[in-house]
């Protein structure tokens, strides 16, 4: 046992799953149901985090660490440590003050979460649309028009094929 | 408060064993959070071992690997056994719940 540093200071001997109890001339106490300490020194346990409504238990509390929340189907988490839980959307849609919205034309959104987003620009980078985009899916470039121009080809056409067993005449 | 009974603490020599044991009175439900404390003449109580709520035992670093703490529900016992002992561990023990202690065992390792 660490006297020597527990006369300097008591609590920093506390260990995590414990707190440094002022009403008992600073003895560490094992935190009391339902709170948690994850580290050592504490002068208090934390109330443990409750998963409750669209939020669903992912971990349980413990003496030493926190409960972790994730949402419910139908809902994504945002923000540190999963603080609110957001409607989805289905692909093709963005969610909006009034509910999920279908993106307008010439944006797509792929996930459930998130807003819609613009069409690649294919002509920036001097190619041309190969796939046209949809409400799901931005639209795939394809070669650039000079490449596609008749002759401008380099790919050269396979020999005609032979039947095998036969010589040329 | 009630009054929690400790028992089992005695004499050893280095590197022996005691079990310690502490009692709940019949008339009290089981306890969610136990805990073995030790004390020196003129020092403070020390933080040895204890049951958590969610049942799960935790040991300060100087315990881990020599004692083991569980518990007995059916007859609202928590025991304490405390191997390789040391002339370190030298101390009286109380168990502790809430604001319950027992009255303390003596246990003396000495060769």
């Known amino acids: 046992f660490e006297r020597t540093r527990s006369l300097q200071d008591p609590c920093s001997n506390c260990p995590a799953g414990t707190f440094c109890d002022n009403n008992r001339n600073q003895i560490c106490s094992p935190c009391p149901p339902n709170s948690f300490s994850s580290a050592g020194g504490q002068r208090t346990c934390d109330i443990c985090r409750q998963c409750k409504g669209v939020f669903r238990t992912r971990k349980e509390c413990s003496s030493t660490s926190n409960a972790e929340c994730d949402c419910t189907p139908g809902f994504h988490c945002l923000g540190a440590g999963c603080s609110m839980c957001e409607q989805d959307c289905k692909q093709g849609q963005e969610l909006t003050k009034k509910g999920c919205k279908d993106c307008c034309f010439g944006t797509f959104n792929d996930q459930k979460r998130g807003i819609c987003r613009p069409w690649t620009n294919c002509s920036l980078d001097g190619k041309s649309v190969l796939v046209n985009g949809t409400k799901e899916r931005d639209v795939v470039c394809g070669p650039s028009p000079a490449d596609l121009s008749p002759g401008a080809s380099s790919v050269t056409p396979p020999a005609p094929a032979r039947e095998p067993g036969h010589s040329p005449q | 408060a009630v009054q929690l009974v400790e028992s089992g603490g005695g004499l050893v020599q280095p590197g022996g064993s005691l079990r310690l044991s502490c009692a709940a009175p019949?008339?009290?439900?089981?306890?969610?959070?136990i805990a073995w404390y030790r004390q020196g003449p003129g020092k403070q109580r020390e933080l040895v071992a204890w049951?958590?709520?969610?049942?799960?035992?935790h040991y300060v670093d100087s315990a881990k690997g020599r004692f083991a703490i569980w518990r007995d529900n059916t007859k609202k016992t928590t025991y304490l056994q405390m191997n390789s002992l040391k002339l370190e561990d030298t101390d009286v023990y109380y168990c502790?719940?809430?604001?319950?202690w027992g009255q303390g065992t003596q246990v003396t390792v000495s060769s």
């Open positions: 049951i958590a709520w969610d049942d799960i035992a």
């Open positions: 019949g008339n009290i439900s089981s306890l969610r959070v």
């Open positions: 502790n719940s809430g604001d319950s």
